[in-house]
């Protein structure tokens, strides 16, 4: 008789999840030699231990602490790039501007990027059929709690000028319910962070509006100012040109506004 299994609303664990996490960890130690000392087997064991045999709606930040400890990493605190709803461009940017880091450029972010995972209460099985959806099922699921934990730690580590890339094509350019709006904004440390600089990325070629005047950006400015952190905002009208100018800053066309 097949054992009854909880059916969740979200997609199941990414196929070959253990192999993917291990392979990513090994690859990370290769491309980031300063993390050579990381024991990828122990990292996987800690990752697995955070959610295996636990109810996937009852995961806590505490469950991830062993993994957080093993993944401890120092990134330059003044070179942090946050993003919201515009991950691909943020990653393209840090691939060119190698001294800046998104969360996914750190070991733990790199391991989990674009993956889904969950287990089942009281069994050592990984659930490849379905996992809880944040809205439809529960917020304290393995994936959401992981990203909340690493995002909080990443924001807490930031200092000086912190940059955030925001998607100007969305109805809410700044969304209070995003990870950036609900976690990172509130965990920037005013005693360390002087300024949050928003880069609003325009979608349309002919879009010359000043999206820094958008009501949601004003809301972000208000939240940040109340936290005693200065706020500044720049329009990036041409993201393609923006990336090109990061690659080739000497290009004569890169002196004008992008």
């Amino acid at each position: 008789v097949p054992r009854w299994r909880q059916q969740w609303s979200g997609p199941g664990t990414t196929k070959r999840f253990p192999e993917t996490v291990l392979a990513r960890c090994v690859k990370y130690t290769e491309i980031h030699p300063e993390m050579r000392h990381v024991d990828c087997q122990s990292v996987w064991d800690a990752f697995k231990g955070a959610f295996i045999s636990k109810h996937p709606c009852n995961i806590t930040e505490e469950d991830y602490q062993p993994l957080m400890k093993l993944g401890t990493q120092t990134v330059p605190c003044n070179k942090i790039l946050l993003w919201s709803r515009i991950k691909d461009l943020a990653h393209q940017f840090t691939q060119v501007q190698r001294d800046m880091f998104t969360l996914e450029d750190t070991l733990l972010g790199y391991l989990a990027d674009d993956l889904t995972w969950c287990g089942e209460f009281n069994t050592s099985k990984i659930n490849y059929q379905s996992c809880p959806d944040w809205r439809k099922d529960c917020s304290n699921n393995p994936v959401s709690v992981f990203w909340k934990t690493v995002s909080r730690r990443f924001a807490e580590a930031a200092c000086d000028v912190v940059h955030v890339m925001l998607n100007g094509s969305r109805s809410k350019i700044f969304d209070k319910n995003s990870t950036f709006g609900s976690v990172e904004v509130h965990n920037l440390q005013p005693e360390k962070v002087q300024t949050l600089e928003a880069w609003v990325i325009h979608g349309g070629r002919e879009d010359s509006r000043d999206l820094c005047q958008d009501p949601t950006i004003k809301e972000l400015e208000s939240i940040i100012s109340k936290r005693n952190i200065q706020f500044s905002c720049k329009n990036i009208y041409r993201p393609d040109k923006f990336l090109q100018c990061v690659k080739n800053p000497e290009d004569s066309s890169c002196t004008s506004e992008i």
Epitope: V26, K27, E30, R36, Q41
Partner: antibody, heavy 114, light 107 residues
């Protein structure tokens, strides 16, 4: 327990080549990178390069490009270093080592002499 | 390539003494520094990683410190078995590079 067992000493002629092996046991071979290090008698240590046993990708010290070639055989959990165009300058002890926890092989002595 | 300079080629100490072996990097390597001990006739053994973290099983007499360009390995309450060569290594950037080594002699 983790072990890296290297092949025995080699005495070879100048101009020839040699393949040094490093048999890994006691851990999941593809989960840790393997690096190679050269030590000449009474001298310091020189880093040759590193290989990812899972993907086969390598990073070499520029100085050893064309001299050393790193490979792995996953089925036998063995890493290899092929050294070509040997000269007396290549006479040394060669070590393999594993990333994380710094496990080292016992070393392979290479003597290049006519 | 990053040059790791160990200026003390030899150091001499008595059992129970404390010595500090220094290593200077030619550019900032953060904390990506390891220390190795090589006893006569043996393979190097890693003592310290990330500048200050001891590997399991390494006696707490061995302490690493430093960041950026200046690093120190301190051995306190020296024992006769500490007779060895000590090497620093940076692993911040490929190619990894080693210091030339410091030979610790026991009086």
């Amino acid at each position: 327990q983790v072990q890296l067992q290297q092949s025995g000493p080699e005495l070879v002629r100048p101009g020839t080549s040699v393949k040094v092996s490093c048999k890994a046991s006691g851990y999941a071979f593809t989960t840790y990178l393997v690096e190679w290090i050269k030590q000449r008698p009474g001298q310091g240590l020189e880093w040759i390069g590193v290989i990812n046993p899972g993907s086969g990708s390598t990073n070499y010290n520029e100085k050893f490009k064309g001299k050393a070639t790193l490979t792995v055989d996953r089925s036998s959990t063995t890493a290899y270093m092929h050294l070509s165009g040997l000269t007396s300058d290549d006479s040394a002890v060669y070590f393999c080592a594993r990333y994380a926890y710094g496990y080292w092989g016992q070393g392979t002595t290479l003597t290049v002499s006519s | 390539d990053i040059v790791m300079t160990q200026s003390q080629k030899f150091m001499s100490a008595s059992v129970g003494d404390r010595v500090s072996i220094t290593c200077k990097a030619s550019q900032n390597v953060g904390t990506a520094v390891a220390w190795y001990q090589q006893q006569p006739g043996h393979s190097p053994k890693q003592l310290i990683y990330s500048a200050s973290n001891r590997y399991t099983g390494v006696p707490d007499r061995f302490t690493g410190s430093g960041a950026g360009t200046d690093f120190t390995l301190t051995i306190s309450n020296i024992q006769s078995e500490d007779l060895a060569d000590y090497f620093c290594q940076q692993y911040s950037t490929y190619p990894f590079t080693f210091g030339s080594g410091t030979k610790l002699e026991i009086k």
